[in-house]
């Protein structure tokens, strides 16, 4: 298992919500990506392929997510101060072998300007 801070901008704020970007190498074909808040699994997305190369995408803990060829974005809405925490992208690589797990993360700071419904 490889642990480290994300070497890219992991948090993108918009409209009172945040997009949490979890990147993976282009070469990875099949994987599970989990978004952890502290030690708790908030969201996950699994991409696998069958023997006919058909892609299956599953979520056991569903969040609004978006898949590209080198990242999974998880979206959290209605931000408040309780969202401030360490968030980790837990990547399990199934393909190509060997099986590998990597953990990258960062701290989500919540500022008044990013909250969805500020009191005037």
């Amino acid at each position: 298992e490889i642990n480290g801070s994300a070497n890219y901008e992991m948090f993108i704020f918009h409209n009172g919500g945040v997009q949490i970007l979890c990147k993976y190498p282009d070469i990875v074909q099949q994987f599970k990506m989990q978004l952890l808040k502290g030690g708790q699994i908030l969201c996950d997305l699994t991409k696998t392929k069958g023997s006919g190369n058909t892609v299956s995408i599953k979520s056991l803990k569903f969040c609004h997510s978006q898949l590209s060829n080198n990242s999974v974005s998880f979206f959290l809405y209605n931000l408040d101060h309780s969202h401030a925490n360490y968030y980790f992208c837990n990547l399990s690589i199934f393909d190509p072998p060997p099986f590998k797990v990597t953990l990258t993360g960062g701290y989500l700071h919540i500022y008044e300007s990013q909250l969805c419904c500020q009191l005037k």
């Epitope: 070469i27 074909q29 099949q30 699994t46 696998t48 392929k49 069958g50 023997s51 006919g52 190369n53 058909t54 299956s56 599953k58 199934f94 393909d95 190509p96 072998p97």
Partner: antibody, heavy 117, light 111 residues
Framework: EVQLVESGGGLVKPGGSLKLSCAAS????????MDWVRQAPGKGLEWVGN????????EYSPFVKGRFTISRDNVKNILYLQMNSVKSEDTATYYC??????????WGQGTLVTVSS | DIVMTQSPSSLAVSPGDRVTINCKSS??????????LTWYQQKTGQAPKLLIF???TRHTGVPDRFMGSGSGTDFTLTINSFQTEDLGDYYC?????????FGPGTKLELR
């Protein structure tokens, strides 16, 4: 240790039906696509079809499409092959296989299906 | 559908021989960085066993005398120093698209 054990084979008349089962153990069944592969006596291997982890996707060989149905029970860890309208050319040993992400990495011992009147 | 062909269909071999089995696909099996080509061994009365995946990667526990090579549409399984326990049928297989198909097989027999 991964184990796949097929059952349900036997003699069936042309046009008849048969349901094969494959009991899986030694791995997290619900994490894997599963396939059926068959082998006619003295012949080569032929893919029958597959099913994804939760049963929402199935694919079939053109030779069996519309006649065979693959399903799974992730609570009991069992893979099924429902064979309807069978033909003599369906006579074969049927193998249950685990699709280990990039190859069939585990196979059952096979169960023989004979279609004959 | 992709058609897989193999040559020879059978081969008489002796212990210590270098054995070469060829497999040809009707279209390229290259997807991204990998060739979606697999080799299986089947001994008489047994289920097939995985030998090589992604054209050249040996499966866990497969002796290093088994080697896979090739690219595009042409692939080779080589057994360096054939042993009697290697007798059986060998199949290539693609998973480039649906339906995945097997080659017709190559039977290794004792000379």
């Amino acid at each position: 240790e991964v184990q796949l054990v097929e059952s349900g084979g036997g003699l069936v008349k042309p046009g008849g039906s048969l349901k094969l089962s494959c009991a899986a153990s030694g791995f997290t069944f619900s994490d894997y696509w599963m396939d059926w592969v068959r082998q006619a006596p003295g012949k080569g291997l032929e893919w029958v079809g597959n099913i994804d982890e939760d049963g929402s996707i199935t694919e079939y060989s053109p030779f069996v499409k519309g006649r065979f149905t693959i399903s799974r029970d992730n609570v009991k860890n069992i893979l099924y092959l429902q064979m309807n309208s069978v033909k003599s050319e369906d006579t074969a040993t049927y193998y249950c296989t685990r699709w280990g992400r990039f190859a069939f990495d585990s196979w059952g011992q096979g169960t023989l299906v004979t279609v004959s009147s | 559908d992709i058609v897989m062909t193999q040559s020879p269909s059978s081969l008489a071999v002796s212990p210590g021989d270098r054995v070469t089995i060829n497999c040809k696909s009707s279209q390229s099996l290259l997807s991204g960085s990998f060739h979606y080509l697999t080799w299986y061994q089947q001994k008489t009365g047994q289920a097939p066993k995985l030998l090589i995946f992604y054209a050249s990667t040996r499966h866990t526990g497969v002796p290093d005398r088994f080697m896979g090579s090739g690219s595009g549409t042409d692939f080779t399984l080589t057994i360096n120093s054939f042993q009697t326990e290697d007798l059986g049928d060998y199949y290539c297989h693609h998973h480039y698209n649906a339906p995945p198909t097997f080659g017709p097989g190559t039977k290794l027999e004792l000379r």
